[in-house]
Each structure stands twice: as structure tokens, then as C-alpha cells.
Interface confidence: medium
């Protein structure tokens, strides 16, 4: 990938390596700014009918460095009896999401993009699509 | 959460300042390398007894420009027969996301990482926990 | 609904360079990438290179590195493909093509090209 | 590069048929894999996303199916402004790539 040779934006924006040495405000990392209206731990997890657990992935050098990762707990969905039911399936919703990664050994630190596929959430699924009527 | 420790690999980062100039490879975002094994757009969407549509959200200064967030199509969940069950709730699972905002009028281009939520799907809960048996 | 609009045919001689237009409309420049593809008489697609105007990054086809440049004016909304060193195996159909820069169903990149330019003919004859 | 083989090359189909196009990547490309229609003197136009995702305005009777590296598209019901040369798209790696293209005529 190189950069566009004649932007009307940048004009002497420098070609290959410019992707790779890009400022960036990583300001927001370090904010504690309210999450109060965003941050709700929700305990759908356990209340729906395709209910999920969490596990925690862990690594020091990545920003977000904890990321809670859905897996699904049953290959079927729970009915109103807490039944497992055999024409319904429990799948798991993901979501590419974008993580830093710290590059060790290099001063001042750099920062490189990294895209990971988390599981989200579960969601119940039927073999056939139904709409509601 | 703050990436940078007292360390002694690069002793004089400054902390608050030292975040609104970091160099990141941001290589990843433009490749195209294979993603077969995890790249699956699925039709859960529809097939799930919660369903939900996708909306548009655009901002040509964000990276992703396009977000599509999830709303989930009905309040209630839609049963076997294909008619709405008015015991069990159809919610939205939501995750943050880190974006990128191009800031304007700066050359080169310089970036800064926003936290976003977004709707991710919907999945179906009862008002009460349940357990499989 | 986005537009994309081509300039018009080109009849160029072997050895020759060729600069076609493409000109967007109806949507924001920045929020999509375009990839040109092009079409030999009576044969299929094929894919020569995209730019992605966020970040301001070209992609080429090995087949056309070092032949093909594309580029971008965000002022005009418009994207250019040259390619050089014409040869009679150049006379072909080139398209330019909208590839979406979409966060969609959970996924970071979209890159199905979901609109198309009209076409320019380029003729390379001696 | 990936290499998309479709087939048949060439289908004559009577209206109200079912068509069935396939095609073969020479490897693993998860869902990356996009579906056009080509009319004579015409633009390419998008008509599946992502193996099996429809587009807005594109009638329902095409459908899209597969993963992995076999690919189907399927035209249940065909009718005569269907005439048109089908191509597959795979996104997954640089270069993009097409298949050699399926021309469907109507008997």
C-alpha cells in the first residue's frame, strides 16, 4: 500500500512508509471521561434464551489490555421451561474490533493497529428466516 | 488504563503530552490480507428470534466512515409460529469500538482513537433467570 | 445513491499514456475508495488497483505496478487512473468502481464494489 | 493470486427456470465472495454481498449461498431482462479477483 502521490490535501505526503509512522491522540486511552451512560454491564449474559459466558483475555501490551470475550453456553436455545430446544440454535454474534498493541523495544513507544474478532454476545437463531406477523 | 509503565525501556515518556503524539503503524487497516478465517458477515439478522436491521451512521472524518448499527426490529421476540411473544423482550447487545477521527486541516495526517458504542445485534431475554436443565 | 462519472473515450497510439477521470457525486468522497477494473473485448473483469481516500493509500495489481498510477482530488470529488506504456493489449473498457469503507455486520471493511462507473473506452492502435 | 472458476460457461435457460451458476476458489475465502450481472454495453452491477447478502433494489428471486471456496448463485424464476454474463468477486486477498464470467441467454 502506498499513499496518493498527488493529494490536494497533503501534496508532499511522503509514499510507503507514511502508513506506518502515523501521529496519532491517543488522549482518549488515558481519559477517565463518564461511561456512566455507555458502560452497563448488562446481565443479559444469563437472562437470554441463547445465554453466553464470559472469559477474560489478557495482554499487558494491548490497549484495551482486558477484553471480555463471549462464548455461547449451550448449541441450543433455553425455552420457557428451561429446556433446551432441539430446532433452535445459540450463535454467537462477533465483532472485528480494533485494538493498540504496544511494539516493545522502541523509544519513544510506538503503537501499531491490530483488527481481533470477539465474540459479543449470543443471539438464537432458526434454521429457516420467520418474520413476525 | 494508561500503556505506559514506569519503564525502564524508554525512562523519559512523559505521560499527558507523550499521548497526543504517538507514532502508530496503522499498516493493518489497509490490508487486505487474507481473512478467510475469520471474516463471516452473517444472516443472523434476520434469522434470529430477535431480529434486527442495520442503520447507517456516516462521518467521512471517522474511520470506519460507515458504521451500521444494529436496532433491534421489535420489543418482543418473535416466536416458532412466527408471532410475536409478548413474556420475552427482544435487547440490543452493545460493545465499544475504538474508531480513528482524521483531524482536518493537519499535514501529514494525523489521527486520534475515539471510543464509540455501537449495537452490535439483538438477542431474547425473559424477565427472569433461567437455567437449562 | 452515489455516481460515479467517467470521461470520455481515448484513441492513443503504442507507447502513449492514458489519464482517465472519475468523477463522484452524491455521497461523501472520504467515506468509500475506488478501484479501477477493466475489460479487454469479449473477456472478463480485471481488478488494476483502488485508493482509499481516508487514509490517502493506493493498492495496485502487480500485473500494472510500476505502469498505473492512481490518484485522488478531494477538492473535485474526482479520482484519476494513468496507465503508461500503452500497448494494443491495453484496448479495453476501464471502470472505475465504489468499494464501501463500512463498519457493516460487525466487520471493520467492506470491498464489493456496489456502484459502478459508465466506462471509458481506450483504443491503442498504431 | 486466488482463482475463481465459475461454471457453466455458458447456460441457455427458458424462462420461469431455476438457474444455478457456481464458483471455485483456489482457496479458502471465508465469505469474501461478491456476485455481478453484466448486460451487453453496460456497467457491472452488484447483486450479492458476502456469499449470500442481498442488495437493496435487487429483485428477491437471486439468492446467493456457500463459503469456503464453493460459491452458488441461484436465480429461482428466471425472467427475460435476466439475460446478462454473471460474475463471481473474491475480496479476501490482493488482488481482487473474477471468475471468467457465466453468460445466461434465454431460449
Known amino acids: 500500500a502506498v499513499l496518493i502521490p498527488q493529494s490536494s490535501v497533503c501534496p508532499n505526503a511522503e509514499a510507503n512508509n507514511f502508513l506506518q509512522n502515523v501521529k496519532v491522540n491517543l488522549k482518549v486511552i488515558n481519559s477517565l471521561s463518564s461511561k456512566a451512560s455507555s458502560r452497563r454491564p448488562s446481565d443479559y449474559l444469563n437472562r437470554s434464551t441463547s445465554p453466553w459466558t464470559l472469559s477474560r483475555n489478557e495482554d499487558p501490551d494491548r490497549y484495551p489490555s482486558v477484553i471480555w470475550e463471549a462464548q455461547c453456553r449451550h448449541q441450543r436455545c433455553v425455552n420457557a421451561e428451561g429446556k433446551l430446544d432441539h430446532h433452535m440454535n445459540s450463535v454467537l454474534i462477533q465483532q472485528e474490533i480494533l485494538v493498540l498493541k504496544r511494539e516493545p523495544e522502541k523509544c519513544p513507544f510506538t503503537f501499531r493497529v491490530e483488527k481481533m474478532l470477539v465474540g459479543v454476545g449470543c443471539t438464537c437463531v432458526s434454521s429457516i428466516v420467520r418474520h413476525a406477523s | 488504563a494508561v500503556l505506559i509503565p514506569q519503564s525502564s525501556v524508554c525512562p523519559n515518556a512523559e505521560a499527558n503530552n507523550f499521548l497526543q503524539n504517538v507514532k502508530v503503524n496503522l499498516k493493518v487497516i489497509n490490508s487486505l490480507s487474507s481473512k478467510a478465517s475469520s471474516r463471516r458477515p452473517s444472516d443472523y439478522l434476520n434469522r434470529s428470534t430477535s431480529p434486527w436491521t442495520l442503520s447507517r451512521n456516516e462521518d467521512p472524518d471517522r474511520y470506519p466512515s460507515v458504521i451500521w448499527e444494529a436496532q433491534c426490529r421489535h420489543q418482543r421476540c418473535v416466536n416458532a409460529e412466527g408471532k410475536l411473544d409478548h413474556h420475552m423482550n427482544s435487547v440490543l447487545i452493545q460493545q465499544e469500538i475504538l474508531v480513528l477521527k482524521r483531524e482536518p486541516e493537519k499535514c501529514p495526517f494525523t489521527f486520534r482513537v475515539e471510543k464509540m458504542l455501537v449495537g452490535v445485534g439483538c438477542t431474547c431475554v425473559s424477565s427472569i433467570v433461567r437455567h437449562a436443565s | 445513491e452515489v455516481q460515479l462519472v467517467q470521461s470520455g473515450a481515448e484513441v492513443k497510439k503504442p507507447g502513449e499514456s492514458v489519464k482517465i477521470s472519475c468523477k463522484a457525486s452524491?455521497?461523501?468522497?472520504?467515506?468509500?475508495?475506488i478501484s479501477w477494473v477493466r475489460q479487454a473485448p469479449g473477456q472478463g473483469l480485471e481488478w488494476m488497483g483502488g485508493i482509499t481516500h481516508f487514509f490517502g493509500i493506493t493498492d495496485y495489481a502487480q500485473k500494472f505496478q510500476g505502469r498505473v498510477t492512481i490518484t485522488a482530488d478531494e477538492s473535485t470529488t474526482t479520482a484519476y487512473m494513468e496507465l503508461s506504456g500503452l500497448t494494443s493489449d491495453d484496448t479495453a473498457v476501464y471502470y472505475c468502481a465504489r468499494e464501501p469503507n463500512d463498519f457493516w455486520n460487525g466487520y471493520y471493511d467492506t470491498h464489493d464494489f456496489d456502484s459502478w462507473g459508465q466506462g471509458t473506452t481506450v483504443t491503442v492502435s498504431s | 493470486e486466488i482463482v475463481l472458476t465459475q461454471s457453466p460457461d455458458f447456460q441457455s435457460v427458458t424462462p420461469k427456470e431455476k438457474v444455478t451458476i457456481t464458483c471455485r476458489a483456489s482457496?479458502?475465502?471465508?465469505?469474501?465472495l461478491h456476485w455481478y450481472q453484466q448486460k451487453p454495453d453496460q456497467s457491472p452491477k452488484l447483486l450479492i454481498k458476502?456469499?449470500?447478502h442481498s442488495i437493496s433494489g435487487v429483485p428477491s428471486r437471486f439468492s446467493g449461498s456457500g463459503s469456503g471456496t464453493d460459491f452458488t448463485l441461484t436465480i429461482n424464476g428466471l425472467e427475460a431482462e435476466d439475460a446478462a454474463t454473471y460474475y463471481c468477486?473474491?475480496?479476501?486477498?490482493?488482488?481482487?479477483?473474477f471468475g471468467q464470467g457465466t453468460k445466461v441467454d434465454i431460449k
Open positions: 458476502y456469499a449470500s
Open positions: 482457496q479458502n475465502i471465508g465469505s469474501e
Open positions: 452524491g455521497g461523501s468522497f472520504r467515506s468509500y475508495g
Open positions: 468477486h473474491q475480496s479476501d486477498t490482493l488482488p481482487h479477483t
